[in-house]
C-alpha cells in the first residue's frame, strides 16, 4: 500500500493530520488494520472505503485522523482475508 | 504574487460575534498553514492559531479556544476566523498570515493580510 | 508557555550608528526564531528566519544570530526607514509566541 500525509509541513505535537492508506486492483475486498509504533491498534477516527472497477477489481482507501505525539509511527496493514496474506506500510513523524 | 486581503473594520457590541475574513491569491490555499495574529494597540503581537486548509487541521492558543473558531472556504480560497461573545479586551487589529516554505524546511510568516480592525464598544 | 522577553522596549538612534536588539527566549527554542519588522500604521514583514537567515528582499544591514535561548537583531548602519517596531517569535512548540516588541526611534 502507498501512504500520504496532510498537513506534511512544518508539524507540531498536537497537529491533527489526515494518513491515508491506499491499496489498489485486489480481490475481494481487503481488510485495513492501523496500529502505532509499539503495535497497538488504533481504530478511532479511521475511514475506510472501497470501490469496484469495471473488472470487478477493488480499489481500498483508509483514512486515519490522529492528533500527534512526539514522535510518532503510523502503520496501516492490508489483508486479503481469502489468501491470508498481509501488504503493509508506514510512515514515521518526527 | 502572493497576497492576503482581509475583511475591512468592525464596530460590534460587546456579546455579539464576528467573522473575519482573509482572501488569498497567488499560490495553492490547500498546501500552507494560515495563521491568526492578534495585536492590541500600541501592543506586542499574540498569536491566536492556525489552519491547515488542506484537510482542515487546526491547533489553537489555548488562551484563544473558546473565543475564536478558524476555518476555511477552498472553493474561494479563503480563510475565516469567528470571535464570540466579545469584549472590550477583544478590540484589536487581527492579521492572518501565510506560514510559508521560506527555505527547505525553514518556515515562517512570509506574507500578511493588511489587518481587520475590531472595536467592541456599546 | 515559552516566554519571549525583548529588550529594550525602545531605542532612539542616530542615523548611521549601530542598533542591536535583544530577545531572550524562557527555554531553549533552537534556532526556531523569526525577527519581523512592522512600520507605523503596517502590517509585519519578515526580515529573519531560523534566526540567522535574511529573507527575500531585506537589506544586508540587517543581520539575526544566536540558538537556544539568546537571540539578536542588528542593523548595521540605522536609516530613517528603519523607524519600525520589531517583533521576535519562536515557533519551536505550541503555543508560538512573540516578543512584546521593541520601537526604534529615529533622532
Known amino acids: 500500500p502507498s501512504m500520504t500525509l496532510e498537513p506534511n509541513k512544518d508539524l507540531r505535537p498536537g497537529d491533527t493530520v489526515t494518513i491515508t492508506c491506499s491499496s489498489y486492483q485486489g480481490y475481494p475486498e481487503a481488510e485495513v488494520f492501523w496500529q502505532d509504533g509499539q503495535g497497538v491498534p488504533l481504530t478511532g477516527n479511521v475511514t475506510t472505503s472501497q470501490m469496484a472497477n469495471e473488472q470487478g477489481l477493488f480499489d481500498v482507501h483508509s483514512i486515519l485522523r490522529v492528533v500527534l505525539g512526539a514522535n510518532g509511527t503510523y502503520s496501516c496493514l492490508v489483508r486479503n482475508p481469502v489468501l491470508q496474506q498481509d501488504a503493509h506500510s508506514s510512515v514515521t513523524i518526527t | 504574487q502572493v497576497q492576503l486581503k482581509q475583511s475591512g473594520i468592525e464596530l460590534v457590541r460587546p456579546g455579539a460575534s464576528v467573522k473575519l475574513s482573509c482572501k488569498t491569491s497567488?499560490?495553492?490555499?490547500?498546501?500552507?498553514?494560515i495563521y491568526w495574529v492578534k495585536q492590541r494597540s500600541g501592543q506586542g503581537l499574540e498569536w491566536i492559531g492556525r489552519?491547515?486548509?488542506?484537510?482542515?487541521?487546526?491547533y489553537y492558543n489555548e488562551k484563544f479556544k473558546d473565543k475564536a473558531i478558524l476555518t476555511a472556504d477552498k472553493s474561494s480560497s479563503t480563510a475565516y476566523m469567528q470571535l464570540n461573545s466579545l469584549k472590550s479586551e477583544d478590540s484589536a487589529v487581527y492579521f492572518c498570515?501565510?506560514?510559508?516554505?521560506?527555505?527547505?524546511?525553514?518556515?515562517?510568516?512570509?506574507?500578511w493580510g493588511q489587518g481587520t480592525s475590531v472595536t467592541v464598544s456599546s | 508557555n515559552i516566554v519571549m522577553t525583548q529588550s529594550p522596549e525602545s531605542m532612539s538612534m542616530s542615523l548611521g550608528e549601530r542598533v542591536t536588539l535583544s530577545c531572550k527566549a524562557s527555554e531553549n527554542v533552537g534556532t526556531y526564531v523569526s525577527w519581523y519588522q512592522q512600520k507605523p500604521e503596517q502590517s509585519p514583514k519578515l526580515l529573519i528566519y531560523g534566526a540567522s537567515n535574511r529573507y527575500t528582499g531585506v537589506p544586508a544591514r540587517f543581520t539575526g544570530s544566536g540558538s537556544a535561548t539568546d537571540f539578536t537583531l542588528t542593523i548595521s548602519s540605522v536609516q530613517a526607514e528603519d523607524l519600525a517596531d520589531y517583533h521576535c517569535?519562536?515557533?519551536?512548540?505550541?503555543?508560538?509566541?512573540f516578543g512584546s516588541g521593541t520601537k526604534l526611534e529615529i533622532k
Open positions: 498570515a501565510r506560514g510559508g516554505e521560506v527555505r527547505r524546511d525553514f518556515y515562517a510568516l512570509d506574507y
Open positions: 517569535g519562536q515557533r519551536y512548540s505550541y503555543p508560538f509566541t
Open positions: 497567488g499560490y495553492i490555499f490547500t498546501a500552507d498553514w
Open positions: 489552519i491547515y486548509p488542506g484537510v482542515d487541521s487546526t
